[in-house]
Interface confidence: low
């Protein structure tokens, strides 16, 4: 049985300040059941950017219909990028549970922010 992989195809993305950043993430399987979360940074101090299951993330939208059961694309768009958004973003698959437990992380995508074009 092939184990699920979390694929972040872009090692880095460069976006001008004020624009939107698209961070790509796909998974290779619907198994195991559980939500996707996006984080900036790694380790205990990482910042939650988006949780598929719950929460309010006004600057984040999903590129595809992430609630549909056959969906395997968990790419997100972050609007109105500022220099404070720079960092490495990780797409992380969780296994359903009580609580949900981390199953596998993507390799990360480094977001760099260019100066706003004059």
């Amino acid at each position: 049985e092939e184990e699920l992989q979390v694929i972040q195809p872009d090692k880095s993305v460069s976006v001008a300040a004020g624009e939107s950043a698209i961070l790509h993430c796909t998974v290779t399987s619907l198994i195991p059941v559980g939500p996707i979360q996006w984080f900036r940074g790694a380790g205990p101090a990482r910042e939650l950017i988006y949780n598929q299951k719950e929460g309010h993330f006004p600057r984040v939208t999903t590129v595809s219909e992430s609630t549909k059961r056959e969906n395997m694309d968990f790419s997100i768009s972050i609007s109105n990028i500022t220099p404070a958004d720079a960092g490495t973003y990780y797409c992380v698959k969780f296994r359903k549970g009580s609580p949900d437990t981390e199953f596998k992380s993507g390799a990360g995508t480094e977001l760099s922010v260019r100066a706003k074009p004059s």
Partner: antibody, heavy 118, light 108 residues
Framework: DVQLVESGGGVVRPGESLRLSCAAS????????MSWVRQGPGEGLEWVAG????????WYADSVKGRFTISRDNSKNTLYLRLFSLRTEDTAIYYC???????????WGLGTLVTVSS | EIVLTQSPGTLSLSPGETATLSCRAS??????LAWYQQKPGQAPRLLIY???SRATGIPDRFSGSGSGTDFTLTISSLQSEDFAVYYC??????????FGGGTKVEIK
């Protein structure tokens, strides 16, 4: 054809134990999370417990936590539920149900009746 | 825990009529809601998942709609075999997974 066949129900006294089994056939058992759902006499449906596809994660309703244990043997295509410290309010038909993606139940067994009575 | 409230408790209709069943969630469950049919002495049967997608083999007279907290199951042109109890179930914020209390559709 997908088939789920429960067994092991019966009449027990309060405080006693029981083990329910669910034999699965007609699908790749190890590719699915599984659950037990019960229905008291003349009552609605109550989700009892669930288990991840390889058995590494289990979760329970508050009403049975610490008293019931869900497990599975993928080599035997069998789901189990051990019921300890049974109470009269545990009297119900216990259904084995296959979870689809997103945790709804696409196939159900016919159920096995557990009666707890002094 | 998300509470699902189904209404009405009982619906008395004649064959050929349309049944409209409601399910309200205490929190937003997006489109993560399923509907089941249960006849006396039988196990539940999946009708609708993802709020509006019909399960395999379910006739198109069954349709689901809604998202967020308010959902509807509509059975158009009721057939004799449709008289049963119907349950909704959320899977948007589980576990625990929760079911509604059920709506009985009976012959008038």
């Amino acid at each position: 054809d997908v088939q789920l066949v429960e067994s092991g129900g019966g009449v027990v006294r309060p405080g006693e134990s029981l083990r329910l089994s669910c034999a699965a056939s007609g699908f790749a058992f190890s590719d699915h999370d599984m659950s037990w759902v019960r229905q008291g006499p003349g009552e609605g449906l109550e989700w009892v417990a669930g288990i991840s596809l390889r058995g590494g994660v289990t979760w329970y309703a508050d009403s049975v936590k610490g008293r019931f244990t869900i497990s599975r043997d993928n080599s035997k295509n069998t789901l189990y539920l051990r019921l300890f410290s049974l109470r009269t309010e545990d009297t119900a038909i216990y259904y084995c149900a296959r979870e689809s993606w997103n945790t709804f139940f696409d196939y159900w067994g016919l159920g096995t009746l557990v009666t707890v009575s002094s | 825990e998300i509470v699902l409230t189904q209404s009405p408790g009982t619906l008395s209709l004649s064959p050929g009529e349309t049944a409209t069943l409601s399910c309200r969630a205490s929190q937003n469950v997006r489109s993560n809601l399923a509907w089941y049919q249960q006849k006396p002495g039988q196990a539940p049967r999946l009708l609708i998942y993802d709020a509006s997608s019909r399960a395999t083999g379910i006739p198109d007279r069954f349709s689901g709609s809604g998202s967020g907290t308010d959902f509807t199951l509509t059975i158009s042109s009721l057939q004799s075999e449709d008289f049963a109890v119907y349950y909704c179930q959320q899977y948007g914020n589980g576990p625990p997974l929760t079911f509604g209390g059920g709506t009985k559709v009976e012959i008038k």
